[in-house]
Interface confidence: medium
């Protein structure tokens, strides 16, 4: 395994809850350099498994706004622009990290939380169950 | 915006960087309740825009392991199982929050970071640019 020496300049925590409670710098560093997330912005409409984006807002959470994808159809859009029910539109899920204010309404105290979000939809071949 | 009354029981921060530096409870709460249980899926293989998952590991980041989707083809898989280049496989991207140890190798001091990850792929109709 990789052995990481402890940095001698680390902050020292005397907090009785250590290491459950730590200091986090919220001055967010954005690593999305040279990327253009806007490029994917119209995929929800152009996809053969199109989706709608629903705004999920929670002022007690950071980020407070999360967009949830909901597939528009059970089937997928075929070359004629019609829904083909021999294929399935399914949501692609991802577990993400958010911060929740704890206690509620506190500006400087949070708890880490994992939530499952649907990011978009993809078109899949269905699993056909044959009855014996 | 929504105005939230301050909870009188909030921890007080005397930190000179406040409100940039906050206390975070790392005892992760999992909100993936029974209403949204994780469904293990093989969508990456069954999709008309299939993808491979690549392991991105960074011991200084939480989560340390992130799986990145890379679309297998430029086109999409048609009903015959062949790649149709009249359609495009494109990655669905999402911006996620991660925690990075800061200073490096410190066990109890972190910084929030935003990174862009590809979660899966979807099949879209291409944008055709007509040359005058």
């Amino acid at each position: 395994g990789i052995t990481i020496p402890r940095n001698p300049g680390c902050p020292n925590s005397e907090d009785k809850n250590f290491p459950r409670t730590v200091m986090v710098n919220l001055n967010i560093h954005n690593r999305n350099t040279n990327t253009n997330p806007k490029r994917s912005s119209d995929y929800y409409n152009r996809s053969t498994s199109p989706w709608n984006l629903h705004r999920n807002e929670d002022p007690e959470r950071y980020p407070s706004v999360i967009w949830e994808a909901k597939c528009r159809h059970l089937g997928c859009i075929n070359a004629d622009g019609n829904v083909d029910y021999h294929m399935n539109s399914v949501p692609i899920q991802q577990e993400i990290l958010v911060l929740r204010r704890e206690p509620p309404h506190c500006p400087n105290s949070f708890r880490l939380e994992k939530i499952l979000v649907s990011v978009g939809c993809t078109c899949v071949t269905p699993i056909v169950h044959h009855v014996a | 915006g929504i105005t939230i009354p301050r909870n009188p029981g909030c921890p007080n921060s005397e930190d000179k960087n406040f409100p940039r530096t906050v206390m975070v409870n790392l005892n992760i709460h999992n909100r993936n309740t029974n209403t949204n249980p994780k469904r293990s899926s093989d969508y990456y293989n069954r999709s008309t825009s299939p993808w491979n998952l690549h392991r991105n590991e960074d011991p200084e980041r939480y989560p340390s392991v992130i799986w990145e989707a890379k679309c297998r083809h430029l086109g999409c898989i048609n009903a015959d199982g062949n790649v149709d280049y009249h359609m495009n496989s494109v990655p669905i991207q999402q911006e996620i929050l991660v925690l990075r140890r800061e200073p490096p190798h410190c066990p109890n001091s972190f910084r929030l970071e935003k990174i862009l990850v590809s979660v899966g792929c979807t099949c879209v109709t291409p944008i055709v640019h007509h040359v005058a």
Epitope: G1 | N34, V65, V119
Partner: antibody, heavy 126, light 107 residues
Framework: EVQLVQSGAEVKKPGSSVKVSCKAS????????ICWVRQAPGQGLEWMGG????????DYAQKFQGRVTITADESTTTAYMELSGLTSDDTAVYYC???????????????????WGQGTTVTVSS | EIVLTQSPDFQSVTPKEKVTITCRAS??????LHWYQQKPDQSPKLLIK???HSVSGVPSRFSGSGSGTDFTLTINGLEAEDAGTYYC?????????FGPGTKVDIK
Amino acid sequence: EVQLVQSGAEVKKPGSSVKVSCKASGGSFSSYGICWVRQAPGQGLEWMGGVTTFFGFADYAQKFQGRVTITADESTTTAYMELSGLTSDDTAVYYCARDPNEFWNGYYATHDFDYWGQGTTVTVSS
Amino acid sequence: EIVLTQSPDFQSVTPKEKVTITCRASQNIGSELHWYQQKPDQSPKLLIKYASHSVSGVPSRFSGSGSGTDFTLTINGLEAEDAGTYYCHQSYMLPYSFGPGTKVDIK
């Protein structure tokens, strides 16, 4: 290839404590959790608790709360399980197991125990 | 706390036979159910993860199915080396838990 190597067998007196180590090699230690599972003679598997190595904190089964301490030392890539107030009921084989602890992305597992140590036999006898 | 129950407790099987072991959870756990095999004096070994996903190095005769509360481990064409105890394990919610085990022996 990840390997988990545990410390040797222990014989302890009732009321005493035991500390078992689990040395991990291969892969990045902070990328996964280490769980401890015990198995009494002729019995099934029992989850005792686990440590998130990145943050260094542990979760414990209610049954062992207050009696067990699970820690991880990143500098030596070693996890420890200390059990105090031993009784004859604690005679068992103690296993450490790797918990990949990865965020769900629709397919890859987040919490299966994919690698196990060889087990450490702890005998409590007067 | 999520309780897992397994059936049967014990199964004596002839080689090449099909073996089916079931695991029931006391509440919905999605697909966060894993199967392990343990041979005498050995550590458990992961067989199936997330209810139905194969694990590299595990023979294809082992398969899993189910979601929610009811899960099945199937061994299609038992071999002599498959003798041992099989455990299900849930990772949906802390504390994690194991089923009581199903012992499979060869006739």
